[in-house]
């Protein structure tokens, strides 16, 4: 019969790859003991006297270790061993998707520690400490309300992380306007235009998280391409939530995405969920010469070449650096493609 003391197991954290010696409580060195892990006997050659010696700890070494007096099978001591790593410098980023209400900061560790971590966030606006309210759903996010809009005073957000094996920290400093980044536009829909084989009508909505589009209007950036090609075409729109593509190719399925940005400040949102549409494919009636001329003048681009280069921020390229890139960067390898080329492509 195995008798178990009432005490909870001793919890011990050890570093991955290290060696550890587990004592059998306060048993003497020469006490005759047997060790088990998760109920399985351990080899006697792992013992140094009454102590258990584990070399080169792996994640699989985590478990409940128990030592028993060999004769009576009395449970002498239990150790709940957790193998893990100290935290590396956390990755911290802040973003305002609800400007001018406030912003949120989120964080993560670049590599797992395999053991519990505690994060502590502090936010300073100048010398004033601000409250960062924990997100009810996301444990690695907290929210800060803007107290002074259009402030030139910088924010400093610091995060420290600690676990049983170590501690690390990082901080970022930024201006209020640099972190403004709306959520992607919502409900992007593309429809064919009856009797117009080169037109697609695209509509979308301002992101619902953007609190005041009247006072803080957004501009939009649309990209589209036939599924069979890799190059995107781009259109920047200063206002409105609709656009008609006039240079689509008949019968080719298109993928369309939209991004948003505050008119004045911040960076482009990520791309919206993709909308798919195929232009009207029935053989169109013969158009008048005037109609053909009008068709040509309303076309955004006459080919799949990029539009005129203006410095814009590509939503798809945005990382932590939030750099500005040109449309040449967006398009990848840019070359003119004729309709003849298009018809020679086959779906993959």
């Amino acid at each position: 019969q195995r008798h178990s003391p009432q005490e909870a197991p001793h919890v011990q954290y050890e570093r991955l790859g290290s060696d550890v010696t587990l004592p059998c409580g306060t048993a003497n060195w020469d006490a005759a003991v047997t060790w088990r892990v998760n109920g399985t006997d351990l080899a006697p050659d792992l013992l140094n006297g009454s102590q258990l010696v584990l070399h080169g700890l792996e994640l699989g070494h985590s478990g409940l270790y128990a030592c028993f007096h060999r004769d009576s099978w009395h449970l002498r001591h239990q150790v709940l061993l957790h193998v893990g790593l100290p935290p590396r410098e956390p990755v911290l980023s802040c973003r305002s998707n609800t400007y001018p209400k406030g912003f949120y900061c989120s964080w993560h560790l670049p590599t797992p520690t395999y053991i519990p971590n505690t994060f502590n966030v502090t936010v300073l606006h100048g010398s004033k400490i601000m409250v960062c309210e924990k997100d009810p759903a996301l444990k690695n996010r907290c929210h800060i309300r803007y107290m002074h809009l259009f402030s030139t005073i910088k924010y400093k957000v610091s995060i420290s992380v600690s676990n049983a094996l170590g501690h690390n920290a990082t901080a970022i400093t930024f201006d209020e306007f640099t972190i403004v980044k709306p959520d992607p536009p919502e409900n992007v829909v593309a429809r064919p235009v009856p009797s117009n084989p080169r037109r697609l009508e695209v509509t979308w909505q301002t992101p619902s998280t953007w609190p005041d589009p009247e006072s803080f209007p957004l501009k939009f950036f649309l990209r589209y391409r036939p599924l069979i090609l890799d190059q995107w075409q781009h259109v920047e729109l200063s206002d409105g939530t609709a656009h008609t593509i006039t240079d689509a190719y008949a019968g080719k399925e298109y993928i369309i995405q939209v991004a948003a940005k505050d008119n004045e400040i911040g960076t482009w949102s990520d791309w919206s969920v993709a909308a798919h549409a195929t232009p009207w494919t029935e053989e169109p009636r013969h158009l008048t010469t005037e109609a053909q001329a009008a068709e040509t003048t309303t076309s955004t681009t006459s080919s799949l070449a990029p539009p005129p280069t203006t410095k814009i921020c590509d939503p798809g390229e945005l990382g932590s650096e939030q750099k500005l890139i040109s449309e040449e960067d967006l398009g990848g390898e840019q070359k003119l493609i004729s309709e003849e080329d298009l018809h020679h492509h086959h779906h993959h």
Epitope: H3, N28, W29, A31, H69, D71, H74
Partner: antibody, heavy 120, light 108 residues
Framework: QVQLVESGGDVVQPGRSLRLSCAAS????????MHWVRQPPGKGLEWVTI????????YYADSVKGRFTISRDNSKNTVFLQMNSLRTEDTGFYYC?????????????WGQGTLVTVSS | DIQMTQSPSSLSASVGDRVTITCRAS??????LNWYQQKPGKAPKLLIY???SLQSGVPSRFSGSGSGTDFTLTISSLQPEDFATYYC??????????FGQGTRLEIK
Amino acid sequence: QVQLVESGGDVVQPGRSLRLSCAASGFTFSYYGMHWVRQPPGKGLEWVTIISFDGSQKYYADSVKGRFTISRDNSKNTVFLQMNSLRTEDTGFYYCAAQSSTWPEYFQYWGQGTLVTVSS
Amino acid sequence: DIQMTQSPSSLSASVGDRVTITCRASQSISSYLNWYQQKPGKAPKLLIYAASSLQSGVPSRFSGSGSGTDFTLTISSLQPEDFATYYCQQSYSTPPITFGQGTRLEIK
């Protein structure tokens, strides 16, 4: 011949400190968990603290936790009891004892005791 | 923590008497109980370990029994040198180690 010899007992005022020593001989000291057990005058035995054979594990009675510290020097076959913030109720004979390696553990070897008197 | 209660606290007996001292644990301690004898001005001395095992060098008139929560120390025929204080001690769930409050055995 096994011997445990305690020393360091004295008369001290409440709030003061005292350090007891226990010198061991006649057995492999570094294999044994060592205890301090005390006995107020005319009263029963009270366990105070234990230190494991290698010094890695230490436990204390609630009555002394945070005030007393046990330590050992295996190279000198000696165990120590550092007693801080002494109270009148700490008065008594202090024995060091070596625990058995068999189960159930018992106090295999005892010293003769040293008297600690805490009085103003 | 496990509490140990001895009874009686003291008793008077004569040489040759059979004497029984009991010890009760506040919860089951299997057979992990030890008995000590202490004479005035001396350190305690182990008599019985594991409830019923006689320590080497201890006279056979001493015996122990019991398991779980109730234990007894019996001296079958008291000798003059047996007048002392007796303590039980549990080593089932430690630390802390706990002793009974002691039973003082006096000459009648």
